[in-house]
């Protein structure tokens, strides 16, 4: 089965999404909606996705949710939530994208995607 | 504006051999997986064969297994199907499709089809 | 092999709902794609994610996903729905399309 860790010219698609989430926001993101904080460490992309996912009616983030299930292993549905998740906190949508935006730049910048 | 020609299509003997070709155009064509889905006359959806973005694993269905190859050249932006060996039952229309993001590619949903070319094989 | 089956033929009045089952083993565990097909076209995606509609697909058309089965349900169905649909899924990797079920549009 294909590998677990996404190829640099994947990881910079998504990048490329998020930057344009961030560039292209005017009225608050999804309405200001809000989701729960995750540990960005191994597994973060299927935690980000359940992060997501559970954002409904939000066309700004759709292509994101669906890029994010190309580096999860395993099917994401609403309401499911693994142990990644920092469950106390949750921050808006806005944020969430901003904080793995970051991260992803910063694991780029150092290589870490083979 | 993403899209996707297909071309190399044909009449072909049996046993003959045929190499189908798919340039793409209006997106990172190295980041995405890219299938190949054929169609005989009157028939439903089949899929032939993917070959993943970057990580470059591939995956066969178990009729064309061992007799068609799949190929890319990100330089180029052109996905290829190498057909050898080919029977009476690859008759179809083949389509190439634009597929997942990532090493789960196929988590995605196959979002962008060619118009397809056709693949005859007969005496 | 891993198979998905659809029934081969639903009939449906304009304006009425169309609902297309697709049945595979524990299908609900796997994503689930739904695709549109007119004569002479290339498929189109409708559903992805087992109830998400790409842009440009209208409201009409919505899945769901659960236990064996996956259904693709058109709300208030217009003739130009009337074509040929094809669930799909991944499984040990490959993928698998439905058998297809035809759709008509009576009247």
């Known amino acids: 089965s294909p590998g677990p860790v996404p190829p640099s010219t994947a990881l910079r698609e998504l990048i490329e999404e998020l930057v344009n989430i961030t560039q292209n926001q005017k009225a608050p993101l999804c309405n200001g909606s809000m989701v729960w904080s995750i540990n960005l460490t191994a597994g973060m992309y299927c935690a980000a996705l359940e992060s997501l996912i559970n954002v409904s009616g939000c066309s700004a983030i759709e292509k994101t949710q669906r890029m994010l299930s190309g580096f999860c292993p395993h099917k994401v549905s609403a309401g499911q939530f693994s142990s990644l998740h920092v469950r106390d906190t949750k921050i808006e949508v806005a944020q969430f994208v901003k904080d793995l935006l970051l991260h992803l730049k910063k694991l780029f910048r150092e290589g870490r995607f083979n | 504006e993403v899209q996707l020609l297909e071309s190399g299509g044909g009449l072909v003997q049996p046993g003959g051999s045929l190499r189908l070709s798919c340039a793409a155009s209006?997106?990172?064509?190295?980041?995405?997986?890219m299938s190949w889905v054929r169609q005989a006359p009157g028939k439903g959806l089949e899929w032939v064969s993917a070959?993943?973005?970057?990580?470059?694993?591939?995956y066969y269905a178990d009729s064309v297994k061992g007799r068609f190859t799949i190929s890319r050249d990100n330089s180029k932006n052109t996905l290829y199907l190498q057909m050898n060996s080919l029977r009476a039952e690859d008759t179809a229309v083949y389509y190439c499709?634009?597929?997942?993001?990532?090493?789960?590619?196929?988590?995605?949903?196959?979002?962008?089809w060619g118009q397809g070319t056709t693949v005859t094989v007969s005496s | 092999s891993y198979e998905l089956t659809q029934p081969p033929s639903v009939s449906v009045s304009p304006g009425q709902t169309a609902s297309i089952t697709c049945s595979g083993d524990?299908?609900?565990?796997?994503?689930a794609c739904w695709f549109q097909q007119k004569p002479g076209q290339s498929p189109v995606l409708v559903i992805y994610?087992?109830?998400k509609r790409p842009s440009g697909i209208p409201e009409r058309f919505s899945g769901s996903n659960s236990g064996d089965t996956a259904t693709l349900t058109i709300s208030g169905t217009q003739a130009m729905d009337e074509a040929d649909y094809y669930c799909?899924?991944?499984?040990?990797?490959?993928?698998?399309f439905g058998t297809g079920t035809k759709v008509t549009v009576l009247g």
């Open positions: 499709v634009q597929d997942g993001l990532g090493p789960y590619f196929y988590n995605y949903g196959m979002d962008v």
């Open positions: 209006g997106f990172t064509f190295s980041s995405y997986a």
């Open positions: 070959f993943s973005g970057s990580g470059g694993s591939t």
């Open positions: 524990k299908l609900g565990d796997k994503y």
């Open positions: 994610h087992d109830s």
């Open positions: 799909q899924a991944w499984d040990s990797s490959t993928y698998v």
